[in-house]
């Protein structure tokens, strides 16, 4: 098995691939790529390697979260001499190789972006055969997914002493500002943002005491748009009905 010295450096910006006689391993990825939820994004990744004219079997891998150990979201394999990298894994069918690994390009397209795709991604290439070698991006590319606000839940809940409270949860990136409006609240009441632990895109605002019957409206807004939803409070002999 032929191995050559690996250079563990990684360029954080897409830099021009140099062509010295003794090429070293390196990977070029941008620090961040931004796109809107629902759209597609391209994660660029190009590499250099020391194995001139290598045309043996290769595997291209993209993983999420952390290098080396994170879950794979995409994997394809190309047979000796083939430029076709046959997909072996594409999580939810949304990942597709745009680049040609034979030409040192592992760029990946991600379709139908969701806020959950907002993670760091790492590209990796593996050679097998006469040459047994591999290299993986250590820093990766951060996919920043933006999204207009969407109210995911609005509800009226009982609270102590026969009172009621309203909760509104919205998602978006940037995290939306939430405001309540309703009877005796004036035009609107700004809510303090409270992103949930582990749910960075979710924001919840509470109206702790609903003192009047009527319609309560939650408005979520960020730089990409706004959304609103309402609940209705009707107290009949101490009972409540809520509808959105």
């Amino acid at each position: 098995f032929v191995r050559t010295k690996i250079d563990t450096t990684e360029n954080l910006l897409n830099t021009e691939v140099h062509s010295s006689p003794a090429q070293r391993w390196s990977m070029q990825v941008p620090p961040e790529v931004s796109a809107e939820a629902g759209d597609a994004a391209v994660l660029p990744c190009t590499f250099t390697h020391p194995h001139r004219h290598y045309d043996g079997p290769l595997t291209a891998i993209w993983r999420a979260g952390e290098p080396y150990a994170g879950p794979q979201v995409f994997r394809c394999a190309a047979a000796r001499g083939s430029e076709l990298c046959q997909t072996a894994l594409s999580l939810h069918g949304r990942f597709r190789l745009l680049g040609n690994p034979r030409r040192n390009d592992l760029s990946l397209r991600v379709e139908r972006l969701a806020l959950a795709d907002d993670r760091r991604y790492f590209c990796r290439v593996e050679f097998a055969g006469d040459v047994h070698d591999r290299y993986e991006s250590r820093h990766g590319v951060r996919l920043h997914v933006t999204a207009a606000p969407r109210i995911v839940n609005i509800s009226v809940l009982p609270s102590p002493a026969h009172a009621f409270r309203a909760l509104c949860t919205a998602e978006g990136e940037p995290p939306p500002a939430l405001a309540w409006s309703g009877p005796a609240l004036g035009n609107s009441l700004a809510a303090v943002r409270s992103p949930r632990e582990g749910h960075g895109h979710l924001v919840t605002a509470e109206l702790p005491a609903l003192t009047h019957d009527g319609r309560y409206t939650c408005t979520a807004a960020n730089s990409l748009g706004r959304s609103e939803a309402s609940v209705y409070l009707f107290r009949f002999h101490g009972a409540s009905g809520a509808s959105t």
């Epitope: 563990t8 290098p67 080396y68 994997r75 047994h132 591999r134």
Partner: antibody, heavy 122, light 107 residues
Framework: EVQLLESGGGLVQPGGSLRLSCAAS????????MSWVRQAPGKGLEWVST????????YYADSVKGRFTISRDNSKNTLYLQMNSLRAEDTAVYYC???????????????WGQGTMVTVSS | DIQMTQSPSSVSASVGDRVTITCRAS??????LAWYQQKPGKAPKLLIY???SLQSGVPSRFSGSGSGTDFTLTISSLQPEDFATYYC?????????FGQGTKLEIK
């Protein structure tokens, strides 16, 4: 639960054969290279063999080349080691181990079975 | 083949001590090095991979460093459960090779 469970060890005479199995569960078996690593009594760890996720590439230590065959059945999530022409120096606990993060390479072994003892003696 | 040499082969230490184990490769292996812990009668357990990445679930008192030919495993403050044998392993090229082990004993 993510685990590996070896079986098939035992006492065998020199020149004999044995087939070890390793049943995997809790992860996508075909996505990872798998290996056998052994440890002679009171000694250190010795890599024996590795097979790629799809089974198309196999690698062996010189000490077992031509005598041992690694294989896998991805439909059964099972790894095998066929050991022929066994020698006294093959006496060891045999562990199966999963590669971290790759179907071709073992950057490290992040999951190990409990081991199965193989004793070669007359 | 790449030879991996660990030192010391054994070390005695007390709970709370800082312990360093070194591993030297016979040739440049970049950072393709892993560290394992093994207790008697048990399978090895991965601690560190790619020289310095801490395996999920491993306490942060364990750390790895180094690149090229010289590598170090450090336990910042020994706990009773850390007394075991530690192995380094190179995954730079086949055949994958392990160090001979370092036995960490209670002083």
């Amino acid at each position: 639960e993510v685990q590996l469970l070896e079986s098939g060890g035992g006492l065998v005479q020199p020149g004999g054969s044995l087939r070890l199995s390793c049943a995997a569960s809790g992860f996508t078996f075909s996505s990872y290279a798998m290996s056998w690593v052994r440890q002679a009594p009171g000694k250190g760890l010795e890599w024996v063999s590795t097979i790629s996720g799809g089974g198309g590439s196999t690698y062996y230590a010189d000490s077992v080349k031509g005598r041992f065959t690694i294989s896998r059945d991805n439909s059964k999530n099972t790894l095998y080691l066929q050991m022929n022409s066994l020698r006294a120096e093959d006496t060891a606990v045999y562990y199966c181990a999963k590669a971290i993060g790759s179907s071709w390479y073992s950057d490290a072994f992040d999951l190990w079975g409990q081991g199965t003892m193989v004793t070669v003696s007359s | 083949d790449i030879q991996m040499t660990q030192s010391p082969s054994s070390v005695s230490a007390s709970v709370g001590d800082r312990v360093t184990i070194t591993c030297r490769a016979s040739q440049d292996i970049s950072d393709w090095l892993a560290w394992y812990q093994q207790k008697p009668g048990k399978a090895p357990k991965l601690l560190i991979y790619v020289a310095s990445s801490l395996q999920s679930g491993v306490p942060s008192r364990f750390s790895g460093s180094g690149s090229g030919t010289d590598f170090t495993l450090t336990i910042s403050s020994l706990q009773p459960e850390d007394f075991a044998t530690y192995y380094c392993q190179q995954s730079y090229s086949i055949p994958y090779t392990f160090g001979q082990g370092t036995k960490l004993e209670i002083k």
